[in-house]
C-alpha cells in the first residue's frame, strides 16, 4: 500500500513538475526590465528564450521573436537545449510511469517489469528536473553578470550630460517557475526510484535443511519459488539501484553577453 | 465615432474645489488609459497626470501630487479630474487625452477653462 | 525629469517653404527591447486642443499629411514640413513618451509671412 501510495504519489509530483518545465520554457518573462533603482519608464522590457517583449503603458504589448540561430549567444542555446532535453526526457518518463504504476494493471505484466519501468521513469525525472535546474541556473549566473556590467556603465554620458540609461534586467517569473518544476520533478524521481525498491520482489535465501527420510537422504532447497520473476537475485538489484545513483550530471556556467535583442 | 468631451468652463474663488469631468465615447472606456494636461494662458503644455480605468492605477507628475486627484467611473464612461484647494495658479485649460499605442495621445478632449479668482 | 529642448521658439516662413524644427532630449528616448524612440510630436493651433501628427519619432498618425516627416534617435529629433501650407501655423511640440513623468518640449511656433 505504501509503494503504491510513493509511487503515485511520485507520479503526481513529475507531472506537476514537467508541466512547470514546459510552462517555463515556453515563458516569456525569464528576465524582465529591473526597475529599482531606475528611473520610471513608460516602457516594460521582458525577455524569454524565444522572443523579447514590450509593454507599454498603453497596455500594447509588442513581441519579437529571435528570428536567427547563429546570432544568438551560446549560452542562450545551452539554456534551450537543456529545457527540451528536460522536457523531452520528462515526458518519455511520464509515458513509461504510466505504465508502472501498481494501480494500472496492463496484461500479464510482472512486478518485476513494473519495478524496471519505475526506476527507468524515476532516472528519467531525475534527469530531467537535473536540467531544468542547471539551464534556470546558466541563464541566472547570465544575468547577474550582466546586471553588475551594465551596472558599472549605466549612465555613459558626454560632456557631463545623461545621454543614456541601459536597461538593467533582473530574475523574470519563468526562473522561479523553473526552479520549483524542476526540483519537483527531481522529488517526483527520487520518489519513484523509493517505490521501486519496494516493487522489486525479493528472493528469500533460506538455508539449506536436510530432511532424512529413512533408507535415503534427500535435500529440499525451498525459496526456488520465486526464481521464475527473472529479477535476479538481491546482489543484482543492489547493482540496478548504485547505477541509478550514477545519473547526476555537472553543469560549469560562464558568464556570457545576455543582450541578444 | 471616438470622442472625449469635457465639461463647460469653470469660475472658482481661490480654496474652493472643482472637479472636472471627460467622457469618452466610440470605444471601451477601459481598454485604454486617460492622460491629463495643463495649459496656462500662453504658455505650453504640461502633462499631470493619468488613469488606467482597467486598473485604478494612477500615475502623477511630481508637482501634481497632493491636491490633484484622479478618478472615473466606468458605468458612465467618464474620467474626473478633481483640484482641492484652488490657487490662481491654476488658471488654465485642462485637456484629457487617450492613450494609445506607441504612448501616444491620439485623441484630445476639447479642453475645459478653469478661472480661479477672488 | 526629462528635458525636451525645442529649437527655434519660433520661426517665419513662406507659404511653399521647406521648414524644420529640432527637439532634443536629456535622456535617450529609444528601448533597446524593440529599438523604438518613444518621441510624439503634436499639432496645436490656435484655440484648439493638441493634435497627434508623428508617434515613434517617425511613423506618421493617419490622416497626417506626407508633409510633415518625422526623424532622428537616442536624444535628437526633427520634425520637417517638405512644403509649409497656410493651415500649418500652429505651435509644434515635441514630448517624451519613454520616460515618466511624460514632459513635453516648451513648443516651436510657425508663423506664415
Known amino acids: 500500500m505504501a509503494v503504491t501510495a510513493c509511487q503515485g504519489l511520485g507520479f503526481v509530483v513529475s507531472l506537476i513538475g514537467i508541466a512547470g518545465i514546459i510552462a517555463a520554457t515556453c515563458m516569456d518573462q525569464w528576465s524582465t526590465q529591473d526597475l529599482y533603482n531606475n528611473p520610471v519608464t513608460a516602457v516594460f522590457n521582458y525577455q524569454g528564450l524565444w522572443r523579447s517583449c514590450v509593454r507599454e503603458s498603453s497596455g500594447f504589448t509588442e513581441c519579437r521573436g529571435y528570428f536567427t540561430l547563429l546570432g544568438l549567444p551560446a549560452m542562450l542555446q545551452a539554456v534551450r537545449a537543456l529545457m527540451i532535453v528536460g522536457i523531452v526526457l520528462g515526458a518519455i518518463g511520464l509515458l513509461v510511469s504510466i505504465f508502472a504504476l501498481k494501480c494500472i494493471r496492463i496484461g500479464s505484466m510482472e512486478d518485476s517489469a513494473k519495478a524496471n519501468m519505475t526506476l527507468t521513469s524515476g532516472i528519467m525525472f531525475i534527469v530531467s528536473g537535473l536540467c531544468a535546474i542547471a539551464g534556470v541556473s546558466v541563464f541566472a549566473n547570465m544575468l547577474v553578470t550582466n546586471f553588475w556590467m551594465s551596472t558599472a556603465n549605466m549612465y555613459t554620458g558626454m560632456g557631463g550630460m545623461v545621454q543614456t540609461v541601459q536597461t538593467r534586467y533582473t530574475f523574470g517569473a519563468a526562473l522561479f517557475v523553473g526552479w520549483v518544476a524542476g526540483g519537483l520533478t527531481l522529488i517526483g524521481g527520487v520518489m519513484m526510484c523509493i517505490a521501486c525498491r519496494g516493487l522489486a520482489p525479493e528472493e528469500t535465501n533460506y538455508k539449506a535443511v536436510s530432511y532424512h527420510a529413512s533408507g535415503h537422504s534427500v535435500a529440499y532447497k525451498p525459496g526456488g519459488f520465486k526464481a521464475s520473476t527473472g529479477f535476479g537475485s538481491n546482489t543484482k538489484n543492489k547493482k540496478i539501484y548504485d547505477g541509478g545513483a550514477r545519473t547526476e550530471d555537472e553543469v560549469q556556467s560562464y558568464p556570457s553577453k545576455h543582450d541578444y535583442v | 465615432e471616438i470622442q472625449l468631451v469635457q465639461s463647460g468652463p469653470e469660475l472658482k474663488k481661490p480654496g474652493e474645489t472643482v472637479k472636472i469631468s471627460c467622457k469618452a465615447s466610440?470605444?471601451?472606456?477601459?481598454?485604454?488609459?486617460i492622460n491629463w494636461v495643463k495649459q496656462a494662458p500662453g504658455k505650453g503644455l504640461k502633462w499631470m497626470g493619468w488613469?488606467?480605468?482597467?486598473?485604478?492605477?494612477?500615475t502623477y507628475a511630481e508637482e501634481f501630487k497632493g491636491r490633484f486627484a484622479l478618478s472615473w467611473k466606468t458605468s458612465a464612461s467618464t474620467a474626473y479630474l478633481q483640484i482641492n484647494n484652488l490657487k490662481n495658479e491654476d488658471t488654465a485649460t485642462y485637456f484629457c487625452?487617450?492613450?494609445?499605442?506607441?504612448?501616444?495621445?491620439?485623441?484630445w478632449g476639447q479642453g475645459t477653462t478653469l478661472t480661479v479668482s477672488s | 525629469d526629462i528635458v525636451m529642448t525645442q529649437s527655434p521658439s519660433s520661426l517665419t516662413v513662406t507659404a511653399g517653404e521647406k521648414v524644420t524644427m529640432s527637439c532634443k532630449s536629456s535622456q535617450s528616448l529609444l528601448n533597446s527591447g524593440n529599438q523604438r524612440n518613444y518621441l510624439t510630436w503634436y499639432q496645436q493651433k490656435p484655440g484648439q486642443p493638441p493634435k497627434l501628427l508623428i508617434y515613434?519619432?517617425?511613423t506618421r498618425e493617419s490622416g497626417v499629411p506626407d508633409r510633415f516627416t518625422g526623424s532622428g534617435s537616442g536624444t535628437d529629433f526633427t520634425l520637417t514640413i517638405s512644403s509649409v501650407q497656410a493651415e500649418d501655423l500652429a505651435v509644434y511640440y515635441c514630448q517624451n513618451a519613454y520616460y515618466y513623468p511624460l514632459t513635453f518640449g516648451a513648443g516651436t511656433k510657425l508663423e506664415i509671412k
Open positions: 487625452a487617450r492613450l494609445y499605442y506607441g504612448n501616444r495621445f491620439d485623441y
Open positions: 488613469i488606467n480605468p482597467n486598473t485604478g492605477e494612477t
Open positions: 466610440g470605444y471601451t472606456f477601459t481598454n485604454y488609459g
Open positions: 515613434w519619432a517617425s
